[in-house]
Interface confidence: medium
């Protein structure tokens, strides 16, 4: 069968028809519709939005649209006992209290059910003690404190600024340092770009604005009570003491007005260097405790949030494939938001909605994709990627046999400067070819391709004339598909200029000020960047679902494997004597990479030449491409992280958002000179090299001629 059997127009025209159907005005309208009230996971409002999306996707023409529900652990503030932090004097009197809520933005004063700022899954507690300022609370910040400055965080409340790494890693680091509470705050150095006004007059964070967010360390487990299995009606749930990834100490976020009041009194050690200073008019002393006259004052946290098993709802839409209905290309993004979700997630959900509408329009004209396309509106992403993970756990056997690709669709924008793509190397060529066909929305690049503006503004650090494409980390719904199941994945959005804007994420991230107006007034008034992101995400899905031969190039994997092997080898070579003493060799890894390169090259040659009219051979070659990503999965997972099973990529152990290459070897080598037992530590390095070399070799062999 040809891929056009279900239609009377050529594939090229199909793609053009699909892209031409995408309209900026529709995305704008959908964004407005999705952002008028909060859609917090587990609430009635979010359930109603799920039903609305289900109904509209059906109208758009999908074959079926179902709700998939799960009962998962969520976390909410106590409505009658608000969370706050106070400074108390020696008599225990509260002489300063942090604010209980963010001042609502203009036009939203009467909106109900705005959840106050809180750290989701914080345990309850009222610890009091001296404060220690720990910078970003990264691994290296605690090394500086404990090893260099000899400051002991045990029994202290630590205050850390948001940014650089996932907040859950900050909390984990604080726990390991012995802290009894964590205060997270947004420093203007990270969340207030110079020369821009604060909301509502600009896109900067006002002093009363606060970033919400979960503080779990799930490592890919999904629902903390049902790791590995779906949280369905007959689920066996762990007790809360055995739940995965919950923090053990109270945590609470504040804005920079409140942070100023805590930090201005800090005494003790001066900051070790300028990288520990933010932009507040405070000394950024590390502590412990307050200075001089204030030394008898303490900080007290009052945290009363509760963890509750709550029902969540995914929306799953299906557009059946005409030729290979048992091959799935998935486009998914979340629907739940902390408050209005102006950017996160609804700028992404609006794009997905328009992509569904465009595909539905083509379907109504008699067209079908070659492969099945699944569309997903995930719930409870903000609470730990729960909706996507539970659905993938429930459908893991189908997905591992049938999953071709997963394209993520959270926030479409985090800036309006250039494109940002993170994906498997298998998709590099797809992304390059697609962006060469799309028009750039950027000023000064009229009539030029998206590829050209992207390459100019975000050049690859390795290859001239090519754009930067980053490794997949985590912190979003692709995690279970890529890191656990080994399904080729990618994500794309418009981003800021990282050279000139050093702040973390976008300033209003997870605050009440993330509104429709923020996007419409300041980020993308014409919705041209949203449209471009829709074209990239939609175009990738279209090609993955419709091209006769899957648009994966295994040679690009060979290139990065060599780069990653070189990188990890150079890290290890910082310890030449130990490598000699313990007979540590990377020969097996480099040999496997060489074999992979040669086999991938031969496979690519065969891919050019084979008879595409023979459906059996076509399916065989496509299966080799589809299963290549799967071949990098180790069923045993990474040490202490059983749900991170990809041997080439995993979220960094020090920052969930970042991707790490050869993570097993990297973690074994990390800070190895501090390991008490060097023989054991270097033994683990050798074991991880063995696992990596075996996996690369095994993956290479899946590309060999089958007989």
């Amino acid at each position: 069968k040809s891929s056009n059997e279900a239609t009377n127009i050529t594939p090229k025209h199909n793609m053009k028809a699909f892209l031409d159907e995408l309209k900026a005005e529709n995305i704008k309208k959908f964004l407005y519709n999705f952002t008028q009230i909060p859609h917090l996971a587990g609430t009635e409002q979010n359930f109603q939005l799920a039903k609305q999306i289900q109904s509209q996707w059906k109208e758009f023409g999908l074959d079926s649209v179902e709700l998939a529900h799960y009962d998962v652990l969520l976390s909410y503030p106590n409505k009658t006992h608000p969370n706050y932090i106070s400074i108390i004097n020696e008599d225990g009197n509260e002489i300063f209290n942090t604010s209980l809520f963010e001042p609502p933005p203009p036009g939203y004063e009467n909106v109900s059910d705005i959840v106050p700022p809180f750290s989701a899954f914080s345990p309850q507690g009222m610890p009091e003690g001296d404060l220690v300022y720990v910078n970003y609370a990264r691994t290296e910040d605690f090394f500086k404190l404990e090893r260099d400055m000899k400051i002991n965080c045990s029994g202290k409340i630590v205050i850390a600024r948001y940014g650089k790494v996932f907040r859950g890693n900050k909390v984990k680091n604080a726990q390991l340092a012995g802290a009894k509470g964590v205060i997270l705050y947004s420093d203007p150095a990270d969340y207030f770009a110079p020369g821009v006004k604060s909301y509502p007059d600009g896109w900067n964070l006002p002093g009363g604005g606060v970033q919400r967010g979960n503080i779990l360390n799930l490592n890919g487990a999904g629902d903390p009570l049902t790791p590995g299995y779906p949280a369905n009606e007959y689920a066996y749930r762990r007790g809360i003491a055995e739940a995965v990834g919950l923090p053990s100490i109270p945590v609470h976020p504040i804005g920079y007005y409140d942070a100023q009041k805590l930090l201005e009194k800090m005494g003790g050690s001066a900051p070790p260097d300028s990288s520990w200073r933010g932009s507040l008019k405070v000394p950024y002393n590390v502590g412990p405790g307050f200075t001089g006259n204030f030394s008898t004052q303490k900080v007290k946290m009052h945290i009363h949030s509760t963890n509750e098993v709550t029902r969540i709802y995914n929306v799953i839409g299906t557009l059946r494939g005409a030729v290979e209905p048992d091959r799935y290309v998935i486009l998914g993004g979340h629907r739940d938001s902390w408050v209005f979700g102006g950017i996160d997630p609804q700028s992404g959900a609006a794009v997905v909605h328009e992509i569904v509408r465009s595909f539905g329009t083509l379907k109504k004209e008699g067209w079908r994709p070659r492969r099945t396309i699944l569309f997903a509106s995930w719930d409870a992403e903000e609470f730990g990627l729960l909706g996507s993970t539970e659905w993938a756990e429930e459908n893991s056997r189908l997905l591992q046999e049938r999953g071709v690709a997963y394209i993520n669709a959270d926030s479409s924008i985090e800036g309006n400067y250039t494109l940002r793509v993170d994906c498997t190397p298998l998709m590099y060529s797809l992304v390059h070819n697609l962006t060469k066909e799309l028009k750039s929305p950027d000023e000064g690049f009229e009539g030029k391709s998206l590829y050209e503006s992207w390459t100019k503004k975000s050049p690859s650090p390795e290859f001239s004339g090519m754009p930067r494409i980053s490794k997949l980390g985590s912190g979003n719904d692709f995690e279970v598909f890529f890191q656990r199941l080994g399904i080729a994945s990618g994500r794309a959005r418009y981003t800021k200029n990282w050279e000139t804007n050093k702040f973390s994420g976008y300033p209003l991230y997870h605050s009440v000020y993330e509104t429709y107006e923020l996007v419409e007034k300041f980020y993308d008034p014409m919705f041209k960047y949203h449209l471009t992101v829709a074209q990239v995400r939609g175009g990738m899905v279209f090609e993955l679902a419709n091209s006769i031969v899957l648009p994966f190039d295994c040679r690009d994997y060979a290139v990065v494997l060599r780069k990653y092997a070189d990188k990890i080898y150079s890290i290890s070579m910082k310890h030449p004597q130990e490598m000699k003493t313990y007979s540590v060799s990377f020969d097996s890894l480099f040999s496997a990479v060489k074999n992979f390169t040669e086999i991938a090259s031969k496979f690519s040659e065969r891919l050019q030449d084979f008879d595409k009219s023979n459906p059996i051979v076509l399916r065989m070659m496509n299966d080799q491409l589809m299963f290549l990503e799967r071949a990098f999965i180790d069923p045993l997972g990474l040490p202490d992280r059983p749900f991170y099973r990809h041997v080439i990529y995993a979220p960094s152990s020090h920052n969930k958002y970042a991707g790490e290459s050869f993570p097993g070897i990297y973690d074994a080598l990390f800070d190895i000179e501090s390991k008490v037992d060097p023989s054991k530590a270097w033994g683990e390095v050798k074991r991880q090299i063995y696992v990596a070399a075996f996996t690369v070799q095994a993956a290479a062999e899946t590309l060999s001629e089958v007989a």
Epitope: D148, S154, K574, H575, Q577, E578, T581, E673, V676
Partner: antibody, heavy 116, light 107 residues
Framework: EVKLEESGGGLVQPGGSMKISCVAS????????MNWVRQSPEKGLEWVAE??????????HYAESVKGRVIISRDDSKSSVYLQMNSLRAEDTAVYYC???????WGQGTTVTVSS | NIVMTQFPKSMSASAGERMTLTCKAS??????VSWYQQKPTQSPKMLIY???NRFTGVPDRFSGSGSGTDFILTISSVQAEDLVDYYC?????????FGGGTKLEMK
């Protein structure tokens, strides 16, 4: 095999000075923080000083009992760490051990006797 | 300074017996506690690190446990060569400190 070998101990008069040395082998010396720990019948095991690696700016830390009287130093090109001891007192009499970070490997020790 | 207190100062054991040595920290040191064995005329050798991890080459009759302030070294079946001195030490914070030692003697 990790080896630490101290030398330079001996008899010294109160108020005098002495420099003891430790040569390391079997590991990438420049990566590691090094310590001196001493042992006497009166005080038992007592940590004396630590010197960090180049990446930690060769930071040094000392026990209160020796602060201002001893200097720890290192020469990565010779895989050696030193302890310069001044204004020695009778209570500094001990076997001095050179140890690698977290005291997981110890040398055989060198004896310093402060006596008139 | 964190004071590490070991008790008893000495104890008698027979071959094959199970022995428990105790170490108490004056404040919370997490699990940053090591145990050392010292034979006459030799330097101390690490047995246990991180409160419960056996160091390379240490026989599995030695085990450690505890966290916070209370730590235990257990010898499941004492051998004649184990009748020597044992020290605990903390590397949680400066100054690193050691216990006064426990001498294991023949019954």
């Amino acid at each position: 095999e990790v080896k630490l070998e101290e030398s330079g101990g001996g008899l010294v008069q109160p108020g005098g000075s002495m420099k003891i040395s430790c040569v390391a082998s079997g590991f990438t010396f420049s990566n590691y923080w090094m310590n001196w720990v001493r042992q006497s019948p009166e005080k038992g095991l007592e940590w004396v000083a630590e010197i960090r690696s180049q990446s930690n700016n060769f930071a040094t830390h000392y026990a209160e009992s020796v602060k201002g009287r001893v200097i720890i130093s290192r020469d990565d090109s010779k895989s050696s760490v030193y302890l310069q001891m001044n204004s020695l007192r009778a209570e500094d009499t001990a076997v001095y051990y050179c140890t690698r970070r977290w005291n997981n490997f110890w040398g055989q020790g060198t004896t310093v006797t402060v006596s008139s | 300074n964190i004071v590490m207190t070991q008790f008893p100062k000495s104890m008698s054991a027979s071959a094959g017996e199970r022995m428990t040595l105790t170490c108490k920290a004056s404040e919370n040191v997490g699990t940053y506690v090591s145990w050392y064995q010292q034979k006459p005329t030799q330097s101390p050798k690490m047995l246990i690190y991180g409160a419960s991890n056996r160091f390379t080459g240490v026989p599995d009759r030695f085990s450690g446990s505890g966290s916070g302030t209370d730590f235990i070294l257990t010898i499941s079946s004492v051998q004649a060569e184990d009748l020597v001195d044992y020290y605990c030490g903390q590397s949680y914070t400066f100054p690193y400190t050691f216990g006064g030692g426990t001498k294991l003697e023949m019954k």
